[in-house]
């Protein structure tokens, strides 16, 4: 593209069509090149000549942002772009500006502008750039870092990608990327992106961010893959159904529609090019997974990017096939499947399936892997954000994770997106301006979307004759409590540390949490009725309560709590703006109440009480009771729900963030 | 910039031999999995051969099983596919690939078996 004046003036031009591609983290030359015919210009007799300037500058959303000045042999580099940006040939050919570019970002993109003045004369020649691809962590179906090199290619190119490499990567990490996983690139070395340095993502860099490496590997070692999606021809679309897919299904559908299940790597491309659906669907690799470009709480925990549903709390395994989802669909014809027999052994099946368990939730590492990176991606997930968006899609955390969460966390989680309310929204249908505390009867009130990754389900608490059993943790983490800390933690809900007897008899009425809890005898058990790997304990697969036996005091579980019957009622609160967690407390204090702790929460539950709207509780616990199981408001099981800040299960909420209250008096 | 160039293809009686190449650049040709597939006139693509990056690993299609051989010489960045015992049926355009996006691809080179 050439601007310039009429002849015998100053002429610069860029001989490249426009707009030009090029991949991420290649680099880029421009030729700019320009004709001066007044060189050279002097002002006056006595003064020097004045040299020309070149200007290079990138042109994106009206910003400009100049990368580059020249004058006079010298050259003068925006700091941000230092050792990225260079005029190769000036100043030794002093009439060229091409501009050569390192290590191109998607950022990169735009339109970059080559001027040059010489005295009063100015002229100058664009060119539009995109850089094209995206790069993607990948991880086999069954468990983290089970990919040898070769199968690490392999599961990039049966996802219409092929294996990474560094200056991609660093590329992608420029842009933002950000993943505390050990991956394989074309190099052969493993390396992984990390911007804000944490313990267990420390790497070979310390506290500095930066792209993490450990070299050259062995292709014999195991570690999971990044993956570099180049372009598509094709479109990515969704086909639903009101009851959904299994995924057979799901692949006939796209099949009776012209297409096939799309790949991993042609989502992250519709991802990358504006794709947004809060619904998960099946992919071609039997994954589900779902595309977020506009961050919002209730869709992928108000985090931008390609969210997967993973069964197990730690981010591994696949939902089963015969779950329902969306179809996700790919029509082109510019992929062509490589067949399973073309790597050997079809598909994942040659990769062996490791469980996980009770107590550690550790994975088989490599050598050079330290206990902590291993649990650094397991332990840190994402905190939502339930007021405000984020602009910029950097993943903070190393996973995306589930839409909507089933029972509770290690031993074993068993995730599943569906259908379902956002319990801690405000009605969209309410009276606006509510002073009183007001019931809404949930029919009333149904929004379909997807539940936030927040909010997970307490399966069933059984009703006893004379109370509830129920399992507490603190809202800070799993596994924290001794069993003084135990006995405390149920009297502050409103409740006592519960009996053996009383968790068999729950048990017997059909409870069933797959987490060790200290009981009112020091032993450490949990209930069991569909025994399931890590679920067994000491039972194998019978059904049955689980014990671990006398435990020493000082060791640190969750506890199993029981609440007899209430003296008083449970109400539930709200108003237009909601409230935080101390204006819940103020707001029942001017109703002649307290917060309910969460036993009272259980025992009115126990009488009754059902609520599709989660509340403040008064260990600042948001939760909300369910006596009819409906698919809208969070399963198929009665139960207290709990929302939690952190997929694992654990995690308060941001007390300044705004929900509904339940008030006891 | 990425680049696949085939050679090597050309007019052959059944039962001749044929080796075909592939020059790579732009690309870590030592550490990709390579391909090698075809397409016949009015046909759809067909995968021929696969060689992992190492080239400890090779797997053929059922048809070109034990008359085909798909190789590399890394320090040279060139694919081969060796074809012996060539039939009317193996007469197609031969692509070399590195990923399953035809866009990738280069620009082939044709083989017809005819008598």
């Known amino acids: 593209v050439e601007v310039s004046e009429p002849d015998n003036s100053l002429s610069v031009s860029i001989p490249e069509p426009s707009p030009l591609r090029v991949l991420l983290g290649s680099s880029l030359t421009i030729p700019c090149y320009f004709i001066d015919p007044m060189h050279p210009v002097t002002t006056a007799p006595s003064t020097a000549p004045l040299a020309p300037r070149i200007k290079w500058s990138r042109i994106s959303k009206e910003k400009e942002v100049v990368l580059l000045v020249a004058t006079e042999g010298r050259v003068r580099v925006n700091s941000a772009y230092q050792d990225k940006v260079t005029l190769p040939n000036y100043p030794a050919i002093p009439s060229d500006a091409t501009l050569e570019i390192q290590n191109m970002r998607s950022n990169d993109s735009g339109i970059l502008r080559c001027e040059v003045m010489h005295g009063i004369e100015d002229s100058q020649a664009t060119l539009e750039v995109v850089v094209k691809g995206i790069v993607f962590h990948y991880r086999a179906i069954s468990t983290r870092y089970t990919l040898d090199f070769d199968r690490a290619q392999r599961a990039c190119l049966q996802n219409s990608a092929i294996i990474a490499t560094p200056e991609q990567l660093q590329a992608a990490y420029e842009d933002g990327f950000h993943q505390c996983d050990a991956g394989w690139l074309a190099d052969q070395t493993v390396r992984y992106p990390i911007h804000t340095p944490r313990e267990g993502c420390y790497g070979d860099k310390d506290e500095f961010p930066g792209v993490r490496t450990y070299g050259i590997r062995d292709t014999n070692e195991t570690y999971d893959v990044y993956c570099f999606a180049e372009e598509m021809e094709g479109e990515v679309f969704y086909a639903t159904s009101p009851e959904k897919f299994t995924f057979q299904e799901a692949a006939n559908e796209c099949r009776r529609l012209g297409a096939r299940l799309a790949t991993t790597g042609q989502l992250y491309l519709a991802w990358q090019g504006g794709m947004d659906m809060c619904s998960a669907g099946w992919l071609a690799d039997r994954s589900v997974r779902y595309p977020i470009s506009k961050a919002r709480p209730n869709c992928g925990g108000n985090l931008l990017g390609v969210r997967t549903v993973y069964l197990h709390a730690n981010q591994t395994g696949y939902p089963d096939p015969s779950s329902r989802y969306d179809a996700i669909c790919y029509t082109g014809e510019d992929f062509v499947d490589i067949p399973e027999s073309f790597f050997g052994v079809g598909g994942e099946e040659d990769i062996t399936i490791q469980t996980v368990t009770w107590p550690d939730v550790e994975l088989p590492l490599p050598r050079n892997i330290t206990e902590g990176e291993a649990r650094g991606s397991v332990i840190l997930t994402a905190k939502p954000d339930f007021e405000v968006s984020p602009t910029a899609p950097e993943p903070e955390e190393p996973f995306t994770f589930v839409p909507e969460v089933r029972a509770t966390a290690f031993p074993e989680v068993e995730n599943r997106t569906e259908e379902a309310t956002r319990p801690w929204a405000f009605p969209r249908e309410s009276t606006p301006g509510l002073g009183a505390p007001t019931a809404f009867t949930s029919e009333d009130l149904v929004v379909q979307v997807t539940l936030a990754p927040g909010a997970a389900e307490v399966p069933g608490q059984p009703r006893l004759p004379g109370g509830v059993v129920f399992h507490y943790r603190p809202g800070s983490s799993r596994y924290s409590l001794t069993f003084e800390e135990a006995k405390q933690a149920c009297l502050r809900t409103g409740a006592i540390i519960a009996s053996p007897e009383q968790l068999q008899a729950a048990y017997e009425a059909g409870y069933e949490q797959c987490d060790a809890g200290w009981l009112q005898d020091q032993t450490v058990r949990y209930p069991i009725v569909s025994p399931r790997t890590p679920c067994v304990g000491d039972k194998d697969s019978s059904p049955g309560v689980r014990t671990y036996g006398v435990r020493p005091p000082s060791e640190t579980y969750d506890v199993y709590c029981y609440v007899d019957r209430l003296e008083g009622e449970v109400f539930f609160a709200t108003r237009l703006e909601q409230f935080t967690f101390w204006e819940a407390q103020e707001f029942c204090e001017s109703q002649n109440a307290t917060l309910a702790t969460t036993g009272q929460l259980y025992a009115a539950w126990s009488r009754g009480l059902d609520k599709c709207y989660a509340g403040w509780l008064a260990d600042g616990s948001l939760r909300y009771p369910i006596v009819t199981p409906r698919p809208a408001c969070g399963g198929d099981k009665p139960g207290v729900r709990t929302v939690y800040l952190y997929p694992n299960q654990t995690g308060l909420l941001d007390p300044l963030s705004r929900h509904h209250a339940f008030c006891f008096r | 910039e990425v680049q696949l160039v085939e050679s090597g293809g050309g007019l052959v009686q059944p039962g001749g031999s044929l080796r075909l190449s592939c020059s790579a650049s732009g690309f870590t040709f030592s550490g990709s999995w390579m391909f090698w597939v075809r397409q016949a006139p009015g046909k759809d693509y067909e995968w021929v051969a696969s060689?992992?990056?190492?080239?400890?690993?090779?797997y053929y299609d059922d048809s070109v099983k034990g008359r085909f051989t798909i190789s590399r010489d890394s320090a040279k960045n060139t694919l081969y596919l060796e074809m012996n015992n060539l039939k009317p049926e193996d007469t197609a355009l031969y692509f070399c690939?590195?990923?399953?996006?035809?866009?990738?691809w280069g620009q082939g080179t044709q083989v017809t078996v005819s008598s």
């Open positions: 690939a590195r990923s399953p996006r035809v866009g990738s």
């Open positions: 060689i992992n990056s190492s080239g400890g690993r090779t």
